[in-house]
């Protein structure tokens, strides 16, 4: 690993392929910016179980991105 910290992406590593739908409290999409050059899909889990990053290339992530974009635009 390089010793320096690169960017300020919120996700570490590629992320999980899927999260149980029943466990999802909310989903946030972070689009590429000066801080992080990739799209990030962050799932907040129910019952204070923290957060998980979804692999943005996964089927579930693509569905979530589509859903969020439909809602916003």
């Amino acid at each position: 690993f390089p010793m320096f910290k690169r960017g300020r992406c919120l996700c570490i590593g590629p992320g999980v392929k899927a999260v149980k739908v029943a466990d999802i409290e909310k989903a946030s999409i972070m689009y590429p910016s000066n801080n992080c050059d990739k799209i990030e899909v962050i799932i907040t889990l129910k019952e204070n179980k923290g957060q998980r990053c979804l692999n943005p290339k996964s089927k579930q992530a693509r569905l979530i991105i589509k859903k969020v974009e439909r809602k916003n635009f």
């Epitope: 690993f1 390089p2 570490i12 992320g15 923290g50 957060q51």
Partner: nanobody
Framework: EVQLVESGGGLVQAGGSLRLSCAAS????????IGWFRQAPGKEREGVSC????????YYADSVKGRFTISSDNAKNTVYLQMNSLKPEDTAVYYC???????????????????WGQGTQVTVSS
Amino acid sequence: EVQLVESGGGLVQAGGSLRLSCAASGFTFDDYAIGWFRQAPGKEREGVSCCSSSDGSTYYADSVKGRFTISSDNAKNTVYLQMNSLKPEDTAVYYCAATQGLTIATMWNPVSYDYWGQGTQVTVSS
């Protein structure tokens, strides 16, 4: 079956160095973030260093910054923790832990990790 096996602990004098190893098996190394934690007697488990072998991110707790270095050998599926300028307060059992989907907001929380090694004892004498 996922397995994490730590080694390299021992007794060392203050100011000395140790290199811990965490050998991983049973999962695709690049898909996981692997972190190092420690637990001193009577204290909570605390995060020491965290990284991901796929994107090269490295993070350190303030207490070890500049003294500890995390690295990996992907061919050997092994993560290392090089510990220099050791202090008596570094005495603890050191664990490596692995998970997927980690965020920087939750990387120091042991609950965020799915798999743990059995730990290796590090004792620093003054």
